[in-house]
């Protein structure tokens, strides 16, 4: 006969490990008992359990409540056991020794490998501002056994660097993602991807990039000067800019206070029916925590009466 087992049994921390040991006998051979022991090099054998064909399962005190037989139906030639709630200290060599009748004793060894899946963490770097050079966007750290793999998934252009620290039973891996901040990166996802044999699927942590910037300001509304004439209703100026964080807007008049009746509504300056006193230089002031910008325009309200010499009146009579 011969013993059938696995070279390596791999289990995730906290899960149960099945330690296989099956005796494939010759005609009529019976299994009397199966003894399981921990047999790490340099240390004496430590008994786990004894499976007796007549008296059942006896578990040694050190493993009380942690070693079980598989549920029935059980092949009488199957000496496999279940080690409950595997911990890192369980990692090592195990031996199954099968006593058969009449063939005698057989033994086989297997290695138990306990995987410790990582719990990754992502730490954003310092605030990103347009105009900075190469800057740390985020770092991602994961510790496990064996060492996890840490990579980045993003459309953003950047560079990565990794380092690893070995501990007694695990390894910590840290990867950093550096970039040159630009406004086009705003709102873009930067995802840390952690792979490990103890994970059913990769773990992903996503950080949304925020790059502080403030665009140049410009004022819209004066494209057709002829529309800015006395009496016109609904005239308005709109200040155009964009930024992160979103900017605030402030309107002033360079050559005096804002005329009465002029309404400030955020980025928009609304005028009452135009008069010549609305002529002047208007300044839009845009600011956020990152920067500030100004844009000024000259409003010249036309008086149609001054152009009366150019008018031709048509009189029709019948």
């Amino acid at each position: 006969g011969e013993l059938e087992t696995s070279d390596v049994v791999t289990v995730v921390l906290g899960q149960d490990a099945k330690l296989p040991c099956f005796y494939r006998g010759d005609s009529g051979e019976q299994v009397g008992q199966v003894a399981w022991a921990r047999v790490d090099a340099g240390e004496g054998a430590q008994e786990l359990a004894l499976l007796h064909s007549k008296y059942g399962l006896h578990v040694s005190p050190a493993y009380e409540g942690r070693v079980e037989q598989p549920p029935p139906p059980r092949n009488p030639l199957d000496g496999s056991v279940l080690l409950r709630n595997a911990v890192q200290a369980d990692e090592g060599e195990y031996e199954c020794r099968v006593s058969t009748f009449p063939a005698g004793s057989f033994q086989a060894r297997l290695r138990l490998r306990v995987l410790v899946p990582p719990l990754p963490s992502l730490n954003p770097g310092p605030a990103l501002e347009e105009g900075q050079g190469l800057t740390l966007a985020a770092s991602c750290t994961a510790e496990g056994s064996p060492a996890p793999s840490v990579t980045w998934d993003t459309e953003v252009k950047g560079t990565t660097s990794s380092r690893s620290f070995k501990h007694s039973r695990s390894a910590a891996v840290t990867s950093e993602f550096h970039l040159v901040p630009s406004r086009s990166m705003n709102g873009q996802p930067l995802t840390c991807v952690v792979s490990h044999p103890g994970l059913l699927q990769d773990q992903r942590i996503t950080h949304i990039l925020h790059v502080s910037f403030l665009a140049e300001a410009s004022v819209r509304g004066l494209e057709d000067q002829n529309l800015w004439h006395i009496g016109r209703e609904g005239a308005m100026l709109k200040c155009l800019s964009e930024g992160q964080p979103p900017p605030s807007y402030n309107w002033t008049r360079l050559d005096g206070p804002l005329p009465s009746g002029v309404r400030v509504d955020g980025d928009t300056l609304g005028f009452p029916p135009l008069t010549t006193e609305h002529s002047g230089i208007y300044v839009c002031h845009v600011s956020n925590e990152f920067s500030s910008r100004d844009s000024q325009v000259t409003v010249d309200v036309l008086d149609p009466q001054e152009d009366s010499g150019k008018q031709v009146d048509l009189v029709s009579a019948s």
Partner: antibody, heavy 116, light 93 residues
């Protein structure tokens, strides 16, 4: 080569018993166990029981009261007997050789109809 | 279609410690063992078949489907009372 050949009736009266013999060749019943499985359109494949190489048996709890599996090692035969058959026991019954946690060779199947 | 790759999955309600087998059955025939102990190919089974998985999730992959691969596939666990899956019928497109 490994073979399992089944013999048994195709028609059984309600409340009567079913007996099937599985004759094996190419391996010894002292080395391998034999499982019994049935297949019906309504319930799919169902494991019924097993006789191990040493002669001990295990049964599906749903059939334990009316199922018996035995063997004659010298004749390389395994015997399956199920009592008190009803219409919903109509199925194809298979014997199959045990591999560690699998069934690696199957008989040709015995189609059983329970009807009066 | 012939030449394609297909993956059939089988999920157990609790950990079955890789005590899982895959079978193929063609109309009017007995089931045939393909994979045992979740990942081990049975004798005579073409290498385009492969089994994987652990814990509660298992799968059977067939690379480059051949015409003879069409039929019904069953998974079966051997942890406690053996139970079969309901079967997956693989048909030619």
């Amino acid at each position: 080569q490994v073979q399992l050949k089944q013999s048994g009736p195709g028609l059984v009266q309600p409340s009567q018993s079913l007996s099937i013999t599985c004759t094996v060749s190419g391996f010894s019943l002292t080395n391998y166990g034999v499982h019994w499985v049935r297949q019906s359109p309504g319930k799919g494949l169902e494991w019924l029981g097993v006789i191990w190489s040493g002669g001990s048996t295990d049964y599906n709890a749903a059939f334990i009261s009316r199922l018996s599996i035995s063997k004659d090692t010298s004749k390389s035969q395994v015997f399956f007997k199920m009592n008190s058959l009803q219409a919903d026991d109509t199925a194809i019954y298979y014997c199959a050789r045990e591999l560690i946690h699998a069934m690696d060779n199957w008989g040709q199947g015995t189609s059983v109809t329970v009807s009066s | 279609s012939v030449g394609e790759t297909v993956t059939i999955t089988c999920r157990a309600s609790e950990n079955i410690y890789s005590n899982l087998a895959w079978y193929q059955q063609k109309q009017g025939n007995s089931p045939q063992l393909l994979v045992f102990a979740a990942t081990n190919l049975a004798d005579g089974v073409p290498s385009r078949f492969s089994g994987s998985g652990s814990g509660t999730q298992y799968s059977l992959k067939i690379n480059s489907l051949q015409s003879e691969d069409f039929g019904t596939y069953y998974c079966q666990h051997f942890w406690g009372t053996p139970t079969f899956g309901g079967g997956t019928k693989l048909e030619i497109k």
